[in-house]
Interface confidence: medium
Amino acid sequence: SERCDDWGLDTMRQIQVFEDEPARIKCPLFEHFLKFNYSTAHSAGLTLIWYWTRQDRDLEEPINFRLPENRISKEKDVLWFRPTLLNDTGNYTCMLRNTTYCSKVAFPLEVVQKDSCFNSPMKLPVHKLYIEYGIQRITCPNVDGYFPSSVKPTITWYMGCYKIQNFNNVIPEGMNLSFLIALISNNGNYTCVVTYPENGRTFHLTRTLTVKVVGSPKNAVPPVIHSPNDHVVYEKEPGEELLIPCTVYFSFLMDSRNEVWWTIDGKKPDDITIDVTINESISHSRTEDETRTQILSIKKVTSEDLKRSYVCHARSAKGEVAKAAKVKQKVPAPRYTVELACGFGAT
């Protein structure tokens, strides 16, 4: 009944674990919500309590830590499953409290089934490798803390359903998988299965990640504006629609923000009174190079609009470029009667 700082259900940390495998889940309070760690809290006399709500139920209940073979246990700020069962799926809450202080957070835990080829509804982390960049490695993720350093586990790597043995350019090296020279053909899902003994039992940890081969920084170039260019003139009569595409190629660059924008007479379109619309589309190559197209459209162009400067700008971590479109007013064909009159010397 006393007030407790309730951080609610932390759906950002949707935890997924495989059925029939060990899982260790740290209480998120200390990682994301509080400014002190578990040791400090414990020294200050605070107690960490765990409880859960089963899937499709509203009732919070304590976790049963008295199951055979200590299937579920708590150690410091970690909740352990050795191993998980499908019906462990639910919302778990960890609460830190003493007589004067209380703080709690809930998080969803989903126990997921996998098939013999490691396919499952699990959301997979993506690891990007640079194409043709020399030796690069991926490491079997999230296996720290499951066994002491004195235990030497066996690790088997798979690509899709196939055990990695005698692959041309992919070499298993314990917890690491080395790509001698990454190629598009290396795209796919890679799984490490870590097997280790504990108290006379054998446990397996399955970790799958997606490898995506992307453009190499060696090949990266500043943005390239394909359109507008010097070969195209936008010649329009007042009243016609003016459509100018700005098409820009961006090399893949890790964590780069690619931007494309138009200026009209040096101002952003939002800052001027012309009735202009801009539509953007984005496409990606196999190596995640990006082509952005922004089409500037003026439905009924005026002669004033045709005198303005239309410049497409692009920026990435590699640099900034700009290109003006060649816009001009169509010169109307001379009228026959006027030509005749001029021909006869009329003024």
């Epitope: 390239v224 394909h226 195209v232 459509l243 197209t293």
Partner: antibody, heavy 123, light 112 residues
Framework: QVQLVQSGAEVKKPGASVKVSCKAS????????MNWVRQAPGQGLEWVGQ????????YYAQKFQGRVTMTVDTSTSTVYMELSSLRSEDTAVYYC????????????????WGQGTLVTVSS | DIQLTQSPSSLSASVGDRATITCRAS??????????MHWYQQKPGKAPKLLIK???DLESGVPSRFSGSGSGTDFTLTISSVQPEDFATYYC??????????FGQGTKLEIK
């Protein structure tokens, strides 16, 4: 997916004109150059010219200057190639082909092609 | 205008053979970082299909037995192990400088 669908075969008399169409779908039509390439029976490929749909800007191979006209209808995503003063040596399959975009500014390849339109010029 | 000369004009090969076609440009079609030379495959009654762009970049969906190399004026298309579906005519194509494109005269790859 990108598709270029051309109009059907034509039989014309020498001196006449022919207008071939190419309807594009599956991409932003106005932002890619469209080319026309022809191939006479048993011969190689010959570039006729190109048009940029957003502006209607055209470039024609020297050989066809004055005889070829390329136009565009952006409302239907269709390009047209009209060849006038036809002669028997204009008998060929005419292809429309889109240029790709790449990391380089220019020198584009032709990445998608129509199925071709056979134009026969015979008296 | 830049002229392209392909050799040989025809080539006989057996399934599994390595096949090489060369294309020579009358002047350089390369600049810093890339070459405007592309390769196409054409089967009878069909439209050409892009295989290699910018001298060495394999087009998406094209088998890796196809490769391209070269720069400046001399370029090569190689099929590392010819398959039955590879018997066709191959064209080189340059797009150096808008607005003039030219094609090589073609090389017919035939079954030995």
């Amino acid at each position: 997916q990108v598709q270029l669908v051309q109009s059907g075969a034509e039989v014309k008399k020498p001196g006449a004109s022919v207008k071939v169409s190419c309807k594009a779908s599956g991409y932003i039509f106005i932002t890619y150059w469209m080319n026309w390439v022809r191939q006479a029976p048993g011969q190689g490929l010959e570039w006729v010219g190109q048009i940029f749909p957003a502006s209607g800007t055209t470039y024609y191979a020297q050989k066809f200057q004055g005889r070829v006209t390329m136009t565009v209808d952006t409302s239907t995503s269709t390009v047209y190639m009209e060849l006038s003063s036809l002669r028997s040596e204009d008998t060929a399959v005419y292809y429309c082909a889109r240029t790709d975009f790449y990391r380089y500014d220019g020198g584009y390849a032709l990445d998608y092609w129509g199925q071709g339109t056979l134009v026969t010029v015979s008296s | 205008d830049i002229q392209l000369t392909q050799s040989p004009s025809s080539l006989s090969a057996s399934v599994g053979d390595r096949a090489t076609i060369t294309c020579r440009a009358s002047q350089s079609v390369s600049t810093s970082g890339y070459s405007s030379m592309h390769w196409y495959q054409q089967k009878p009654g069909k439209a050409p299909k892009l295989l290699i762009k910018y001298a060495s970049d394999l087009e998406s969906g094209v088998p890796s037995r196809f490769s391209g190399s070269g720069s400046g004026t001399d370029f090569t298309l190689t099929i590392s192990s010819v398959q039955p579906e590879d018997f066709a005519t191959y064209y080189c194509h340059h797009s150096w400088g808008i607005p003039m494109y030219t094609f090589g005269q073609g090389t017919k790859l035939e079954i030995k």
